[in-house]
Amino acid sequence: TSSASSSSSSAPFLASAASAQPPLPDQCPALCECSEAARTVKCVNRNLTEVPTDLPLYVRNLFLTGNQLAVLPAGAFARRPPLAELAALNLSGSRLDEVRGGAFEHLPSLRQLDLSHNPLAYLSPFAFSGSNASISAPSPLVELILNHIVPPDDKRQNRSFEGMVAAALVAGRALQGLHLLELASNHFLYLPRDVLAQLPSLRYLDLSNNSLVSLTYVSFRNLTHLESLHLEDNALKVLHNGTLAELQGLPHVRVFLDNNPWVCDCHMADMVTWLKQTGVVQGKDRLTCAFPEKMRNRVLLELNSADLDCDPILPPSLQTS
């Protein structure tokens, strides 16, 4: 093996020189750094426009961050022989705007995938399942990181972004083994109803820094393994009884609710009662009212029923213009 592609203890990462020779099984692609000892290839901030074809077979951790990939086609990582060891793939910040169906096919060991910070105008429903069958082969993915993948408004498709992401998560029930899902900073206004039902193995769910106003139609009931639920920095006004009961029924969960604009009126009474007795919410004494104005900054835990009133709704005949 040439010195440009072999690795030694004195130089654990070697930048590759472009070579006219046919690719060797353990060659390091141009514009990448490779360490066979660490089973790692880094092609970072190199303005790559496509995935290198000549990735070494030993690669277990592949970093393709900070590039200009634009489109990830079907079989983007399919090789002969396959990259059978590849377990962690980081594509964050690579200007991807389209991930097509089957993009991650033929990666039998892929456990962690990070697509964060890519403006995904199009995410195929079959991006993770690889096929359009109603039940596909289970994906090996255990961790899926999709933070800040929302495209700018002018690049959005007609359909809802929430719906597009949800379709990819539930297609073929391929992600039933997923333990970690990060969906932070995506401007989600709602969480499609059926998504969580298809992800029964989740242990960690991050929905922070979205625009979720309500969880009324979201069911957490079957997430019996859930350990962390991050709902900080959303637009939540109140959690209703159904949601409270579901969260209380999850045996291991810790819920994070900081920085939401809680509305402290009569509809908040059940949530306040629940907060006072639950051990589920982390940092619950940091939760404060945002509305109405007279209640701003009041600590939820310190409220009682007398504090939580609603202005009476006048019958139309008594309303003044």
């Epitope: 820094n209 920095d233 920085n259 945002a290 900054n297 310190e302």
Partner: antibody, heavy 116, light 107 residues
């Protein structure tokens, strides 16, 4: 109306400790966080930390851990900040304010001078 | 920690003028930004909370705007009592941090 009344100016020697107070009136004392803010002469504002009087909960700026300690007396609606092992750098005006997402009412400040 | 930067440390304007004071954060803070006024005698008051909401009792001559990392406070029809130092503050993440202040003087 909401008022935060702070204790008077203090002149202390290096190495000593001092306890500043902030008396709250005009609102439900245990229902709001109290914030503490430092301002060195001619400088800007620096957040020290916060306390929730009814529960004893505290959050400190890492920079002030070991320097500042918050306590409260809920029977008299007073929050205290103790500053220990005083140095010249602790000379400042210290403000208390009602928090948390915004500091909507402020005390008038307590001037602490540390001098040998 | 999130750094808050007020690039203009002092500003001179005439009575009746419109003045804009800017503030930038080292990372996005989701509109979690407040503005405070400190008078020469040391008195501190909240003016604007959550980027653009006017605190009760504050004249409507004051307004706030911004998003992401960039925010501003605007005062129209400047009056003598507006002579003060103005501070921005983020409450997105602990520790809460303030800008270095912008001192407003009357020309």
């Amino acid at each position: 109306q909401v008022q935060l009344q702070q204790s008077g100016a203090e002149l202390m020697k290096p190495g000593a400790s001092v306890k500043l107070s902030c008396k709250a009136t005009g609102y439900t004392f245990t229902g709001y966080w109290i914030e503490w803010v430092k301002q060195r002469p001619g400088q800007g504002l620096e957040w020290i930390g916060e306390t929730l009087p009814g529960r004893g909960s505290t959050n400190y700026n890492e920079k002030f851990k070991g320097k500042a300690t918050f306590t409260a007396d809920t029977s008299s609606n007073i929050v205290y900040m103790q500053l220990s092992s005083l140095t010249i750098e602790d000379s400042a005006i210290y403000y208390c304010a009602r928090g948390r997402r915004d500091f909507d009412y402020w005390g008038q400040g307590t001037t602490l001078t540390v001098s040998s | 920690d999130i750094q808050m930067t007020q690039t203009t440390s002092s500003l001179s304007a005439s009575l009746g003028d419109e003045v804009t004071i800017s503030c930038s954060a080292s990372q996005g803070i989701n509109n979690y930004l407040n503005w405070y006024q400190q008078k020469p005698d040391g008195t501190v008051k909240l003016l604007i909370y959550y980027t653009s909401s006017l605190h009760s009792g504050v004249p409507s001559r004051f307004s706030g705007s911004g998003s992401g990392t960039d925010y501003s406070l605007t005062i129209i029809n400047l009056e003598p009592e507006d002579i003060a130092t103005y501070y921005c503050q983020q409450f997105s993440k602990l520790p809460f941090t303030f800008g270095s202040g912008t001192k407003l003087e009357i020309r």
